[in-house]
Amino acid sequence: DGPAGSWEQLIQERRSHEVNPAAHLTGANSSLTGSGGPLLWETQLGLAFLRGLSYHDGALVVTKAGYYYIYSKVQLGGVGCPLGLASTITHGLYKRTPRYPEELELLVSQQSPCGRATSSSRVWWDSSFLGGVVHLEAGEEVVVRVLDERLVRLRDGTRSYFGAFMV
Amino acid sequence: DGPAGSWEQLIQERRSHEVNPAAHLTGANSSLTGSGGPLLWETQLGLAFLRGLSYHDGALVVTKAGYYYIYSKVQLGGVGCPLGLASTITHGLYKRTPRYPEELELLVSQQSPCGRATSSSRVWWDSSFLGGVVHLEAGEEVVVRVLDERLVRLRDGTRSYFGAFMV
Amino acid sequence: DGPAGSWEQLIQERRSHEVNPAAHLTGANSSLTGSGGPLLWETQLGLAFLRGLSYHDGALVVTKAGYYYIYSKVQLGGVGCPLGLASTITHGLYKRTPRYPEELELLVSQQSPCGRATSSSRVWWDSSFLGGVVHLEAGEEVVVRVLDERLVRLRDGTRSYFGAFMV
């Protein structure tokens, strides 16, 4: 690697460092599809942004391979736990890769939020946060799923969200 | 951009990279004011530090614009849920900007921790964690609020805290 | 600092930047020892990796001093809360340093997950997430402890994990 090559590499790195990949996507009225698919997200309005990552049908799409800290929070809430709704909620981050047909679990939480209702109030709120570092190749995608998604509460993009940044 | 300019820029970047802005502030006896204001934090003792960010009256103050991963955890606890104390706790990170008169919600969680008391024990503990990437301009501030703050338990700076770092 | 020195420093920094220290360790069947020691982790299989950090008996070992965002999540679960099991769970990240004989609390959460059992189901699930920035010197170690660890549920490395990256 001659000086010129190193120089070019450094210039290149400086430019890429300026756009260290990062994204923060926010919950919106359209997030819950009821179709069994992943949650959908706002990518531009309010606090939402994409920088060096792209978005497609609920998925953050990696354009530059590397290690990423990925995270998601979902706001859960309800009045009691109606029959037919799972009393156990599963909130997870999953990877889609062209090299494998099924989604791969990355980070997952299970919670039993209905137990938070009290004798004086059947209303309950709970929150689930996930975050961790995973390696992602260019073209791979990460999605958020919540089962049962009917317990996810959306409002203004601050309570349920999904993001990532390269570390 | 001539080689000299690029060189200077790289040197500059190297120096600024050495102090990639970061902070971790910890809970202290003085954190809960009861005044309706944000929580206050320890900035120097123990695990607390400021590096490339400043602090003012509970707020982390941004000196260098950019995308930051901001986070906060609060330890909640109590004996039963006495009347008049909110059975729903709201824990949030909020932005103050000179360009707007009111605080802006960034990341928020609602929880119903009192439902964690059991028949055999009225004592309950719960924890709320928030983290996400937001864009902050120089001079903008981020604060933590908890309603009802009387349910926040402080001890040694490890259970309730507030931090950020540039991504 | 002459141009050559600066150049070397930049080349050095570029190389070190390529391996910005990071790690993500995952829960495994061997994680829970019942010995009173910290949780043990998978370091290589599946989603687990070490980059610029090393591992020893449950501990992430720092090789390069600096500020690190450290995190851990544990999946908790059970059927009721059997007598003799603490109704309060403590989940913490602790530092071991050659300069001090005892472990130092870094980030800690207390939860009362058994209260999540409902009248219709004694099964409960809960999750505890911790994350924050701490300064670590070369040779210092970070471990995860959960009391009572019998309530930690392990499966496939996605529900209980431990990681860090330099910020």
Epitope: - | G77, G78, V79, G80, C81, P82, G84, R150, L151, R155 | -
Partner: antibody
């Protein structure tokens, strides 16, 4: 300054009901609980229950559940304690008291002057 | 219910001397370093008056000759230098658990 002013003394027959009022002033009425405590002649203090005027939530000593009813009227900043099926052992001075908190620990920092309820045939 | 037992039932102390009242709970009333125990003073014909909350915090406007201590199940109210106006009945009260309960009272008189 904080004041709790109670209604006057009452004489009731066994089996009847009594409704004692407590008018609050000098603080934000909807931000504090109001508790009721009674004291039989020459005896100690006994907690009856509490009401949170902010939303009307109540908490009762099981001993009085079903007989005591606590309500709050935000428009007049007044709290009421109604005790039904009176018996002679309910003869006591009834106090209202404002509840404050230190974290989740409740204490009674201001008291009404008391209302003597006499149950006699 | 949590039972609070005060001792002694009555106490005669000389002016300027120390008065000590004890309160024992049937179970611990501690949580996370706080003790859910309060103390009140009641003079004849008057309502009770808050002196100490959460075991050791002095209510505003109360003279600092009053102090509270203790944790777990054993608590103490101390009047460091008894004054004539301190003649009254003193009650401990727990707020750890519903129903809130009071001790039976300790009568303090001048010797």
């Amino acid at each position: 300054q904080v004041q709790l002013v109670q209604s006057g003394a009452e004489v009731k027959k066994p089996g009847a009901s009594v409704k004692v009022s407590c008018k609050a002033s000098g603080y934000t009425f909807t931000s504090y609980n109001v508790h009721w405590v009674r004291q039989a002649p020459g005896q100690g203090l006994e907690w009856i229950g509490a009401v949170y005027p902010g939303n009307g939530d109540t908490s009762y000593n099981q001993k009085f559940k079903g007989r005591a009813t606590l309500t709050a009227d935000k428009s007049t900043s007044t709290v009421y304690m109604e005790l039904s099926s009176l018996r002679s052992e309910d003869t006591a001075v009834y106090y209202c008291a404002r509840g404050s908190y230190y974290y989740t620990s409740s204490y009674f920092d201001h008291w009404g002057q008391g209302t003597l309820v006499t149950v006699s045939s | 219910d949590i039972v609070l037992t005060q001792s002694p039932d009555s106490l005669a102390v000389s002016l300027g001397e120390r008065a000590t009242i004890n309160c024992k709970a049937s179970q611990s009333v501690d949580f996370d370093g706080d003790s859910y125990m309060n103390w009140y003073q009641q003079k004849p014909g008057q309502p009770p008056k808050l002196l100490i909350y959460t075991a050791s915090n002095l209510e505003s406007g109360i003279p600092d000759r009053f102090s509270g201590s203790g944790s777990g199940t054993d608590f103490t109210l101390t009047i460091s230098s008894l004054q004539a106006e301190d003649v009254a009945v003193y009650y401990c009260q727990q707020s750890y658990e519903d129903p809130f309960t009071f001790g039976q009272g300790t009568k303090v008189e001048i010797k």
